[in-house]
């Protein structure tokens, strides 16, 4: 008789999740020699230990502490790029601007990017059928708690000028309920961070509005200012040209506003 299994509203664990985490760990430590001391099998064991045999609606940041410890990594604190709802462009940017880092350019972010995972209470099985949805089921699920934990730590590590890429095509350019709005903004350390600079990325080719005047950006400015951190904002009217100019800053067309 098959065991009764909880049906959650979200997609199940990514197929070959353990193998993917291990392969990514091997790749990351190959590309980043400063992380070659990392034991990928121990990393996987710690990752697994955070959610296996635990109720997937009862995961805590504490569950991820062994993994956080193994994945401890120093990134230049003044070269951090946060993003909200515009991951692909942020990643394209750091692939070109190699001295800047998104969370997914760190080991732990790289391991988990785009993956889903959860277990079942009291069994050592990974649930490949379904996992809790943040809205429909519970917020303290393995994936959400992981990203909350690593995002908090990443924001806490930032210093000097912190950049954030925001999606100007969305109705809420700054969304208080996003990871950036609910976690990272509140964990920037005012004693270390001087300025948060927002880059608002325009979607339409003919969109010449100043999206830095958007009410949600003003809301972000208010939150940041109240935390004694300066705020600045720039419109990126042409993201394609923006990337091209990051690649080739000497290009004559890159002197004008992009």
């Amino acid at each position: 008789v098959p065991r009764w299994r909880q049906q959650w509203s979200g997609p199940g664990t990514t197929k070959r999740f353990p193998e993917t985490v291990l392969a990514r760990c091997v790749k990351y430590t190959e590309i980043h020699p400063e992380m070659r001391h990392v034991d990928c099998q121990s990393v996987w064991d710690a990752f697994k230990g955070a959610f296996i045999s635990k109720h997937p609606c009862n995961i805590t940041e504490e569950d991820y502490q062994p993994l956080m410890k193994l994945g401890t990594q120093t990134v230049p604190c003044n070269k951090i790029l946060l993003w909200s709802r515009i991951k692909d462009l942020a990643h394209q940017f750091t692939q070109v601007q190699r001295d800047m880092f998104t969370l997914e350019d760190t080991l732990l972010g790289y391991l988990a990017d785009d993956l889903t995972w959860c277990g079942e209470f009291n069994t050592s099985k990974i649930n490949y059928q379904s996992c809790p949805d943040w809205r429909k089921d519970c917020s303290n699920n393995p994936v959400s708690v992981f990203w909350k934990t690593v995002s908090r730590r990443f924001a806490e590590a930032a210093c000097d000028v912190v950049h954030v890429m925001l999606n100007g095509s969305r109705s809420k350019i700054f969304d208080k309920n996003s990871t950036f709005g609910s976690v990272e903004v509140h964990n920037l350390q005012p004693e270390k961070v001087q300025t948060l600079e927002a880059w608002v990325i325009h979607g339409g080719r003919e969109d010449s509005r100043d999206l830095c005047q958007d009410p949600t950006i003003k809301e972000l400015e208010s939150i940041i200012s109240k935390r004694n951190i300066q705020f600045s904002c720039k419109n990126i009217y042409r993201p394609d040209k923006f990337l091209q100019c990051v690649k080739n800053p000497e290009d004559s067309s890159c002197t004008s506003e992009i």
Epitope: E19, V26, T29, E30
Partner: antibody, heavy 125, light 113 residues
Framework: QVQLQESGPGLVKPSQTLSLTCTVS??????????WSWIRQHPGKGLEWIGY???????YYNPSLKSRVTISVDTSKNQFSLKLSSVTAADTAVYYC?????????????????WGKGTTVTVSS | DIVMTQSPDSLAVSLGERATINCKSS????????????LAWYQQKPGQPPKLLIY???TRESGVPDRFSGSGSGTDFTLTISSLQAEDVAVYYC?????????FGGGTKVEIK
Amino acid sequence: QVQLQESGPGLVKPSQTLSLTCTVSGGSISSGGYYWSWIRQHPGKGLEWIGYIYYSGSTYYNPSLKSRVTISVDTSKNQFSLKLSSVTAADTAVYYCARAKSELVLPYYYYMDVWGKGTTVTVSS
Amino acid sequence: DIVMTQSPDSLAVSLGERATINCKSSQSVLFSSNNKNYLAWYQQKPGQPPKLLIYWASTRESGVPDRFSGSGSGTDFTLTISSLQAEDVAVYYCQQYYSLPPTFGGGTKVEIK
């Protein structure tokens, strides 16, 4: 083409550490896209996978043997090695080194396409 | 770990006749993302190391005679030797590489009747 050759003592005393080396010729151990593996075969029995190492040093061991296994790599000598501690008679086997295919983009572990000839290790006092 | 079960344990076939070996995995080794079965077949002759015959369940390794073929998907796989030759006398193993650790079947001994 790539060839693998195991070497090491054929007799090990119980409780001691078994040490074997695999020398790779005809290709560089440092070229990505491969995992370097150890497999053993007990007398008259099937095959048991022990573990792998990537040229960068990343390892993965069979959980059933993990507490006793260490695999290391020496890229300058084009060799990788196996150490198995606290051996008993149950560790008597033919030990093979092998190359497992992978991908360069994301190195998943695949099938083993090149094998060494194997070396017999007997655990006895 | 994924358990690989082979049948039969041994098989006696006349020269020129067909030999069929079965392999069953305790869970599917088909990866839906790329529609590939993570299964390999090896041949081991006495006193020799295993030799890769088939990978991705049905792709023949370079230099392997076309009388060897692999089929199946999910959990059930077959290695077929269409016309048995004297040099095919060996033990044949299936192996999954869908999940770590890789695991092997117990082997099937093929002899000449």
